[in-house]
Amino acid sequence: QGWQAFKNDATEIIPGLREYPEPPQELENNQTMNRAENGGRPPHHPYDTKDVSEYSCRELHYTRFVTDGPCRSAKPVTELVCSGQCGPARLLPNAIGRVKWWRPNGPDFRCIPDRYRAQRVQLLCPGGAAPRSRKVRLVASCKCKRLTRFHNQSELKDFGPETARPQKGRKPRPRARGAKANQAELENAY
């Protein structure tokens, strides 16, 4: 496969793997996060269930090479794509749920990236050019965000507050960004 065959958009889906939507070159600024530091009471939403954990959001894993101009990563990276219907987990089928479970005039829920992580990648370049080292931004986790129909369509609301980021040396919270767990997954991808 020639170098010219690689996409110049930092993505290259590996043949034979399921092809999921490609991440954008630049992250779009269309997410309004609404979080509080170190606790705080989440806002009451009449259509929410009592337990936030009941809401499910599909996290699809896919593996790809990343490219930077003519240069391509030496190894593929595995990341998440946030996809599928967002809704109470008990109502979501195994396949991507398409059933509208919400009430009329109720809120929509969108599955979007929650946290990002960095992964070091070595990029090999054609023509004997020096290799490059980059840190690629990957989605680390997805979350359901509430889109209130009565408000501006772009207004996304969180279920509730989150605490501050952990300090080095302390164990990260499950939802904190981290690459260590994903590294093993990447190594096992091939």
Epitope: L27, M33, S133, P172, A176, R177
Partner: antibody, heavy 121, light 109 residues
């Protein structure tokens, strides 16, 4: 476009603490990796610490370990740097700096205007 | 902790070429140190010129370029302009911990 606006100048006594804020606009804090850098008058830049997206943790420079705390209020997209047990040598301009939320992590792309902290008895 | 070294001062003639270097006390600087270069003028916040060894930014003038040279990170200025007179800092990434060099005062004379 990421923009950072820092709190105003502070004058503190030795032994006191100072808390500098850095308000983010254009993106949300959770999309960014925030770092803090200081510069004493007539001296060079000194990295104090910041969020490492590889580990998902905040890392502090050894020199400031135990004296600095970096926190974030994601409800207001404001980052804070608190330095305690101040001494005269902590007199400096304190900067917050962040990446540009691009596909590749490029740190220190956007800088706040700086906050002058003067420690004097 | 690692020490990052730079030339304290350098002078270049207008239109001339100059190379600033950045070394590490831990050994050779490599692409895995993701070298950064910053320019700072008096009374201003620093601004990034180069990231990840050689990656320029939209605001970086074409006359600036980054590279690795003899085990050090290098910033080359080709065709110096009077407005390039400033302090230049390099920054190295030691696995998430960053260390700035002492800075190079560049004079365009």
């Amino acid at each position: 476009e990421v923009q950072l606006v820092q709190s105003g100048a502070e004058v503190k006594k030795p032994g006191a603490s100072v808390k500098v804020s850095c308000k983010v606009s254009g993106y949300t804090l959770t999309e960014l990796s925030m770092h803090w850098v200081r510069q004493a008058p007539g001296k060079g830049l000194e990295w104090m610490g910041g969020f490492d997206p590889e580990d998902g943790e905040t890392i502090y420079a050894q020199k400031f370990q135990g004296r600095v705390t970096m926190t974030e209020d994601t409800s207001t997209d404001t980052a804070y740097m608190e330095l305690s047990s101040l001494r005269s040598e902590d007199t400096a301009v304190y900067y917050c700096a962040t990446d540009s939320a691009g596909y590749w992590y490029k740190f220190f792309q956007h800088w706040g205007q700086g906050t002058l902290v003067t420690v004097s008895s | 902790q690692a020490v990052v070294t730079q030339e304290p001062s350098l002078t270049v003639s207008p239109g001339g070429t100059v190379t600033l270097t950045c070394g590490s006390s831990t050994g050779a600087v490599t692409i895995d140190h993701y070298p950064y270069w910053f320019q700072q003028k008096p009374g201003q916040a620093p601004r990034t010129l180069i990231s990840d060894t050689d990656d320029k930014h939209s605001w970086t003038p074409a006359r600036f370029s980054g590279s690795l040279l003899g085990g050090k990170a290098a910033l080359t200025l080709s065709g110096a302009q009077p407005e390039d007179e400033a302090e230049y800092y390099c920054l190295l990434d030691y696995g998430g911990t960053f260390v700035f060099g002492g800075g190079t005062k560049l004079t365009v004379l």
